[in-house]
């Protein structure tokens, strides 16, 4: 008799999930010498242990602590780039400005980026059919809890000037319900972080509005100021040109020396 399986509203675990995590871990540790000491099999065992045989709506940050410990990584705390709803551009930026780090440039973020996973209560099986949706099913699911945990730790580690890339094409440029708005903003440490600098990325070619005056940006400024952190905001009107100039600042159309 086939066992009854809970049907969740979200997509199931990414196919070849164990192999993908292990392969990503090996690749990352090979090209990042400071992480060469990491044993990828142990990382996978700790990752698996966080959600296998557990109810996928009852996952806690505690479940991920063994993985967090194995994936402990020091990044330059003054070179952190947070992002919200504009992941691709943030990643393109840290590819051309390699001294800056998004969460996905760290081992744990790299392992889980764009993947979905969940298990089932009391069985060692991975559920490839469906996983809980954050809105429709439950918020304490394996994926959401993972990102909440690593995002909190990443924000807590930040110092000096912290940068955040925001999507100026969205109706809510700053969204209180995003990971940035609900987790990272509240875990920046005022005793370490001097300024949060928002980069608002424009979508339209002819868009010359000052999106730093947007009500949601003012809301972000208010939240940050109340936490005794300074706030600054800059418009990036042409993201394509911006990336090009970051790569080659000596181009005559780009230069502004300090």
């Amino acid at each position: 008799v086939p066992r009854w399986r809970q049907q969740w509203s979200g997509p199931g675990t990414t196919k070849r999930f164990p192999e993908t995590v292990l392969a990503r871990c090996v690749k990352y540790t090979e090209i990042h010498p400071e992480m060469r000491h990491v044993d990828c099999q142990s990382v996978w065992d700790a990752f698996k242990g966080a959600f296998i045989s557990k109810h996928p709506c009852n996952i806690t940050e505690e479940d991920y602590q063994p993985l967090m410990k194995l994936g402990t990584q020091t990044v330059p705390c003054n070179k952190i780039l947070l992002w919200s709803r504009i992941k691709d551009l943030a990643h393109q930026f840290t590819q051309v400005q390699r001294d800056m780090f998004t969460l996905e440039d760290t081992l744990l973020g790299y392992l889980a980026d764009d993947l979905t996973w969940c298990g089932e209560f009391n069985t060692s099986k991975i559920n490839y059919q469906s996983c809980p949706d954050w809105r429709k099913d439950c918020s304490n699911n394996p994926v959401s809890v993972f990102w909440k945990t690593v995002s909190r730790r990443f924000a807590e580690a930040a110092c000096d000037v912290v940068h955040v890339m925001l999507n100026g094409s969205r109706s809510k440029i700053f969204d209180k319900n995003s990971t940035f708005g609900s987790v990272e903003v509240h875990n920046l440490q005022p005793e370490k972080v001097q300024t949060l600098e928002a980069w608002v990325i424009h979508g339209g070619r002819e868009d010359s509005r000052d999106l730093c005056q947007d009500p949601t940006i003012k809301e972000l400024e208010s939240i940050i100021s109340k936490r005794n952190i300074q706030f600054s905001c800059k418009n990036i009107y042409r993201p394509d040109k911006f990336l090009q100039c970051v790569k080659n600042p000596e181009d005559s159309s780009c230069t502004s020396e300090i």
């Epitope: 400071e34 001294d99 020396e257």
Partner: antibody
Framework: EVQLLESGGGLVQPGGSLRLSCTGF????????MSWVRQAPGKGLEWVAD????????YYADSVKGRFTISRDNSANTLYVQMNSLRAEDTAVYYC????????????????????WGQGTTVTVSS | QSVLTQTPSVSGTPGQRVTISCSGI??????VSWYQQLPGTAPKLLIF???QRLSGVPDRFSGSGSGTSASLAISGLQSEDEADYYC???????????FGGGTKLTVL
């Protein structure tokens, strides 16, 4: 013209002290991270120390840690290095250098290079 | 603190192309820069961010990098290129500058 001018070098006995100065011209000194680099006679370049634009972060080579102090006076556009407990192996030409930074569409970025160098000042430690 | 490794000397005739290598870069996120030091003068920046030429530097000078090594190529060698060349990298994890030992270029 962007320029750095060092001064303060000279002959000093082992165990003695010396303070070198470097004044910047032609750029916004307050915005610039600065470094000291030295070159012993007939040898290669050796980094000595680095300081952030407002002086709140300082970094040192192991060989000078605890003996040298890098500092700056932004109101005078001047960088300093205070050298104490000097040794014969500190004999070198000392250069100050500006860290390369650029503003790309109002965003300030560090390019991890030294784009302006002073002419150097000679320090000789000998009895 | 580690030192980057450079070939101590290279030579070439006018018009030739020479390459200077730099190895021992600890991390793929560290950028390499290249400096020219003419006899009796201060160093001068040629290349930053692995392969970006500083404005005013002739395009005969080019930099390249792949992971843990980098190189400086000089094509169409000229007598005035005779100098010492240094690679350097700022280690973003340790907050230290690391220099190569230098390469003496002789134009025969």
């Amino acid at each position: 013209e962007v320029q750095l001018l060092e001064s303060g070098g000279g002959l000093v006995q082992p165990g003695g002290s010396l303070r070198l100065s470097c004044t910047g011209f032609g750029f916004t000194f307050t915005d610039a991270r600065m470094s000291w680099v030295r070159q012993a006679p007939g040898k290669g370049l050796e980094w000595v120390a680095d300081i952030s634009s407002y002086g709140d972060n300082t970094y040192y080579a192991d060989s000078v840690k605890g003996r040298f102090t890098i500092s700056r006076d932004n109101s005078a556009n001047t960088l300093y290095v205070q050298m104490n407990s000097l040794r014969a192996e500190d004999t070198a030409v000392y250069y100050c250098a500006k860290r390369m930074e650029r503003e790309v569409m109002t965003i300030k970025l560090d390019y991890h290079a030294m784009d302006v160098w002073g002419q150097g000042t000679t320090v000789t430690v000998s009895s | 603190q580690s030192v980057l490794t450079q070939t101590p000397s290279v030579s070439g005739t006018p018009g030739q192309r020479v390459t200077i290598s730099c190895s021992g870069i600890f991390n793929i996120r560290n950028y390499v820069s290249w400096y020219q030091q003419l006899p009796g003068t201060a160093p001068k920046l040629l290349i930053f961010k692995d392969d970006q030429r500083l404005s005013g530097v002739p395009d005969r000078f080019s930099g390249s990098g792949s992971g843990t090594s980098a190189s400086l190529a000089i094509s169409g060698l000229q007598s005035e290129d005779e100098a010492d060349y240094y690679c350097a990298a700022w280690d973003i994890f340790l907050n230290v500058w690391v220099f190569g030992g230098g390469t003496k270029l002789t134009v025969l």
